[in-house]
């Protein structure tokens, strides 16, 4: 495949990323599959600017990103660390709170109204942001 | 009401060190990251540091890294500031300040605490 | 680190007046940007933040705009109370710099 040299329209650049802000509600499987489908995957947010960036644009709406503990230990949908890696978590999260009567916990997370993250019901339809690196191989076939 | 009080300053001489405290009341502390700013006789506003608020994550200003150290105790409602190595350019007035955290601006702030670094 | 100026550093301007101070990063900060207000020997207050949200309590003739690099504190009529320094601050990437200032007084 090429590399990526800019982004596909209607995505947003930042710091040699690609960024597409959805608009409308999935489960979290959903939107993961979604992502992927664009040769790209759920957020991953790395530092203190990504989460800046990504909260300016999503506003006070819960959003889905790339991170969830459905095996267990919480994972990064694309393998960053998650131990040594950047978190914001909101005060007393994430609870894997059992109480919604959904049946099971919290095993997936998302963008509060405030930024800060939460755990929730991955069945919840929330808005999800798609990540893509630049720098990144593209799967598609090369022009002839 | 939300109130910060800060303590813990003093005269002290170049190269020693001081521990700066602010006591919070009339919020949940343990909600809320913290932040250090000074301000020098007659100088503008720097901001210092940051600590999350659950301790986990913490960011100084260039001016302050490996000789300062933030740190909170939630069971005590208590902010932290320890200084090691002060300098004389390190005399100042030491203000806490609470963190709003989506815009990570500071809401609520101390009256300040006047630390002088002489000989 | 993102630098931050402010013009003009004082400026002078009779009661009633319309007054702007500007602010300017060094490089994007997307809306990531805090006003703030000193009065000689108190803390400093804040007054705006993400560039142009009005905290509660703060009077209607402060309003902040800008994105990016450069912002805007306007003070639609200048009153006795808003003689102070006024301080901007960038708050999207650590550490959380200040410009230096702008001084008010009374014409």
């Known amino acids: 495949g090429s590399e990526r040299t800019c982004c596909p329209v209607n995505w947003v650049e930042h710091e040699r990323s690609c960024y597409w802000f959805s608009r409308s509600g999935k489960a979290w499987a959903d939107a993961d599959n979604y992502c992927r489908l664009e040769d790209a995957h759920l957020v991953v947010v790395t530092s203190w600017e990504e989460q800046k960036f990504v909260q300016h644009h999503i506003g006070p709406v819960n959003t889905w990103m790339g991170l969830h503990d459905q095996n267990g230990p919480w994972k990064w949908v694309d393998g960053t660390d998650y131990e040594t890696g950047f978190k914001n978590w909101r005060p007393e999260q994430p609870d894997d709170w059992y109480g919604h009567g959904l049946g099971g916990g919290e095993d997936c997370a998302h963008f509060t109204d405030d930024g800060r993250w939460n755990d929730d019901v991955c069945q919840r339809p929330y808005r999800w942001v798609c990540e893509t690196e630049l720098d990144k191989a593209s799967q598609e076939p090369p022009l002839l | 009401q939300v109130q910060l009080v800060e303590s813990g300053g003093g005269v002290v001489q170049p190269g020693r060190s001081l521990r700066l405290s602010c006591a919070a009341s009339?919020?949940?502390?343990?909600?809320?990251?913290m932040h250090w700013v000074r301000q020098a006789p007659g100088k503008g506003l720097e901001w210092v540091a940051v600590?999350?608020?659950?301790?986990?994550?913490?960011y100084y200003a260039d001016s302050v890294k490996g000789r300062f150290t933030i740190s909170r105790d939630n069971s005590k409602n208590t902010l932290y500031l320890q200084m090691n190595s002060l300098r004389a350019e390190d005399t100042a007035v030491y203000y806490c300040?609470?963190?709003?955290?989506?815009?990570?601006?500071?809401?609520?702030w101390g009256q300040g605490t006047l630390v002088t670094v002489s000989s | 680190d993102i630098q931050m100026t402010q013009s003009p550093s004082s400026l002078s301007a009779p009661v009633g007046d319309r007054v702007s101070i500007t602010c300017r990063a060094s490089?994007?900060?997307?809306?990531?940007l805090n006003w703030y207000q000193q009065k000689p020997g108190k803390a400093p207050k804040l007054l705006i933040d993400?560039?142009?949200n009005l905290q509660g309590g703060v009077p209607s003739r402060f309003s902040g705009s800008g994105s990016g690099t450069d912002f805007t504190l306007t003070i639609s009529s200048l009153q006795p109370e808003d003689f102070a320094t006024y301080y901007c601050?960038?708050?999207?990437?650590?550490?959380?710099?200040f410009g230096p200032g702008t001084k008010v007084d009374i014409k």
């Open positions: 009339g919020f949940t502390f343990s909600s809320y990251a």
């Open positions: 993400v560039a142009s």
């Open positions: 490089q994007n900060i997307i809306n990531y």
């Open positions: 601050q960038q708050s999207y990437s650590t550490p959380f710099t």
């Open positions: 300040a609470r963190d709003r955290a989506y815009s990570s601006s500071s809401d609520y």
């Open positions: 600590i999350w608020f659950d301790g986990s994550d913490k």
